[in-house]
Amino acid sequence: LLCYSCKAQVSNEDCLQVENCTQLGEQCWTARIRAVGLLTVISKGCSLNCVDDSQDYYVGKKNITCCDTDLC
């Protein structure tokens, strides 16, 4: 599986590095942090135990989404 790989970037244009996820059952994930008055911060990668989630974060939310196709 091929996933985009980045950490704490403010633009999807900075999240175009590709990572080859070699473990069976891995998924791609995207974490988006949206906080009032702040930029959205994006992280992406591979995970064996990805679960869609929404967590309280500062005065906003951190949303995690999972997918299982190349560069999804």
């Epitope: 590095q17 080859n20 500062y58």
Partner: antibody, heavy 120, light 95 residues
Framework: QVHLQQWGAGLLKPSETLSLTCAVY????????WSWIRQPPGKGLEWIGE???????SYKPSLKSRVTVSVDTSKNQFSLKLSYVTAADTAVYYC??????????????WGQGTLVTVSS | SPGERATLSCRAS???????LAWYQQKPGQAPRLLIY???SRATGIPERFSGSGSGTDFTLTISGLEPEDFAVFYC?????????FGQGTKVEIK
């Protein structure tokens, strides 16, 4: 057991480039980000930046213009370069493993530290 | 003094979810060691006398019975945003 071993020049003149390397022994190299953190003498900890095996980097914004973190996956090593150093860059520099999930930052294994002194 | 309870505080400048706070211990001449993550989860190999609590802006590290090897500087760290930042450190000294 994970072990991080670091090395590099300890004495620099102003305007030179700091260069440090960290080798990772044991555990998975590809499953983590690998960080550089510094500590000026008698002061607190400051995160500099990090990289993963595929070359994705993240830097502290105030240092980004001077910092390059690179990776050599064939040797399980990663490196720090900090250009145009001044006396304010004098610190103990640590490499560390970042085991944070989903974009978090959590440092669970650390190198032994390298004291870098900048003096004319 | 050894055997006593130590309570260390960390206050965030704005509310962070409880997931995003860690504590480290640093002894002189050594690298920091991760103690607590997620505000209250002990890292691997950390004795049960170390415990963490809190959420929002106020967090606490408690050492229930100080051992001689526990005297050190303790740092809190917010884990969730870039750049990650550390508190200024709290020194626990032998009385």
């Amino acid at each position: 057991q994970v072990h991080l071993q670091q090395w590099g020049a300890g004495l620099l003149k102003p305007s030179e480039t700091l260069s440090l390397t960290c080798a990772v022994y044991g555990g998975s190299f590809s499953g983590y980000y690998w960080s550089w953190i510094r500590q000026p003498p008698g002061k607190g900890l400051e995160w500099i930046g990090e990289i993963n095996h595929s070359g994705s980097t993240s830097y502290k914004p105030s240092l980004k213009s001077r910092v390059t973190v690179s990776v050599d996956t064939s040797k399980n090593q990663f490196s720090l370069k900090l250009s145009y150093v001044t006396a304010a860059d004098t610190a103990v520099y640590y490499c560390a493993r970042d085991r944070g999930d989903y974009g978090d930052f959590l440092f669970d294994y650390w190198g032994q530290g390298t004291l870098v002194t900048v003096s004319s | 003094s050894p055997g006593e309870r130590a309570t260390l505080s960390c206050r965030a400048s704005q509310s962070i979810g409880s997931t995003y706070l860690a504590w480290y211990q640093q002894k002189p001449g050594q690298a920091p060691r991760l103690l607590i993550y997620g505000a209250s989860s002990r890292a691997t190999g950390i004795p049960e006398r170390f415990s963490g609590s809190g959420s929002g802006t106020d967090f606490t590290l408690t050492i229930s019975g100080l051992e001689p090897e526990d005297f050190a500087v303790f740092y809190c760290q917010q884990c969730g945003s870039s750049p990650p930042t550390f508190g200024q450190g709290t020194k626990v000294e032998i009385k």
